[in-house]
Interface confidence: low
């Protein structure tokens, strides 16, 4: 399904990278890992060296939005987390540089970052009812809630 039409005329301008090299762990303490060139998955790791390290870039909305809008990039790469549809895996999209401006269908690169205590949620800007989620026996995907796990802990300074 296409991104929500009311978002199509909103412009998002890149501000700066706000976090470098952090790990995302879900509520089952599974870390997000690379499954292959295209997809992510989650696994219980003994060694966090295997976990994906992310950078988080902040964007400012042209409409006065109180939400923090971010892009997620795999550290030291040009791969960006990209939303598809509900229950579809998020993709890793290669781009030569971080987009300076994002609008329209490109909003599948953006997520609203919300925190509640130690819980972090990433809602798709293109699909505001759907979250980045882990799911048993599946890839990291977009989901509306249970049985998928939508809350993450951010682990920083794991180097």
């Amino acid at each position: 399904s296409a991104p929500f039409s009311f978002l199509s005329n909103v412009k998002y301008n890149f501000m700066r990278i706000i976090k470098y090299e952090f790990i995302l762990n879900d509520a089952l303490n599974q870390s997000i890992i690379r499954a292959n060139d295209q997809y992510l998955t989650a696994a219980a790791l003994h060694n966090l060296d295997e976990a994906v390290k992310f950078d988080m870039g902040a964007y400012k909305s042209s409409k006065d939005d109180a939400k923090i809008t971010v892009i997620l990039r795999i550290s030291k790469t040009q791969l960006y987390v990209t939303a598809q549809d509900e229950d579809q895996p998020v993709l890793l999209k290669e781009m030569p540089e971080i987009p300076k401006t994002i609008t329209g269908s490109e909003t599948n690169l953006l997520f609203f970052w919300e925190t509640h205590g130690t819980k972090n949620y990433f809602t798709s800007v293109a699909h505001p009812n759907l979250f980045i989620a882990t799911k048993q026996d599946y890839w990291v995907c977009l989901a509306g809630g249970p049985p998928s796990i939508t809350d993450f802990q951010i682990l920083e300074n794991q180097a």
């Epitope: 890992i33 690379r34 499954a35 292959n36 998955t41 696994a43 219980a44 790791l45 003994h46 060694n47 295997e50 026996d137 599946y138």
Partner: antibody, heavy 122, light 107 residues
């Protein structure tokens, strides 16, 4: 070269247990997810179970969940399949097979063992 | 779980024939599909992965196509050593599954 050698098959009675082993050589065993696939006589292939490279993640077909346990010993390069509460429909040749490096479980299986047969006594 | 349906279950063909086998997934699996060849008493052999990539050492007469839920394995010119059973396998879900197989036999 990559080698996978299954052992432990044999004749067993329904309801009993059996433990299959698969000994790996020719590659760094601890970097690969590994699988068990079975084939009943004259039938097609059925994926049974898989375990991630470090043993932390395990996956099972619905037909064996709760009865079979997959495990591995990376220090000895051995994959195991503990089969409990065996049923007549578990009669098959059991193959171990290798996936891609590191954590990938959903993978094409490029290397297979020769298989070990599990049958039942009447 | 994802169900894989192969057709036909058997096909009679002669050396030199073009043979086509189809595989359908019960849900979309992008290009996460592999094809195997198995001969009696032997372990399966990987032919094609990710729908269309030829495994190293596999003759170019084998080709794969498709994405989403419908896939095809084609043998452009059947050779004597190609008489065997062929299986598709989805590698999209962590719970792998195979198609029921297609036996290619002598006409």
């Amino acid at each position: 070269q990559v080698q996978l050698v299954e052992s432990g098959g044999g004749v067993v009675q329904p309801g009993r247990s059996l433990r299959l082993s698969c000994t790996a050589s020719g590659f760094t065993f601890s970097m690969f997810g590994v699988h068990w696939v079975r084939q009943a006589p004259g039938k097609g292939l059925e994926w049974v179970a898989a375990v991630s490279y470090d043993g932390s993640n395990k996956y099972y077909a619905e037909s064996v969940k709760g009865r079979f346990t997959i495990s591995r010993d990376n220090s000895k390069n051995i994959l195991f399949l503990q089969m409990d509460s065996l049923r007549l429909e578990d009669t098959a040749v059991y193959y171990c097979a290798r996936g891609r490096p590191k954590v990938v479980i959903p993978a094409p299986l490029a290397h297979w063992g020769q298989g070990t047969l599990v049958t039942f006594s009447s | 779980d994802i169900q894989m349906t192969q057709s036909p279950s058997s096909v009679s063909a002669s050396v030199g024939d073009r043979v086509t086998i189809t595989c359908r997934a019960s849900q979309g699996i992008s290009s996460w599909l592999a094809w195997y060849q198995q001969k009696p008493g032997k372990a399966p052999k990987l032919l094609i992965y990710e729908a269309s990539n030829l495994e190293t050492g596999v003759p170019s007469r084998f080709s794969g196509s498709g994405s989403g839920s419908d896939f095809t394995l084609t043998i452009s010119s059947l050779q004597p050593e190609d008489f065997a059973t062929y299986y598709c396998q989805q590698t999209s879900s962590f719970l792998l599954s195979f198609g029921g197989g297609t036996k290619v036999e002598h006409k």
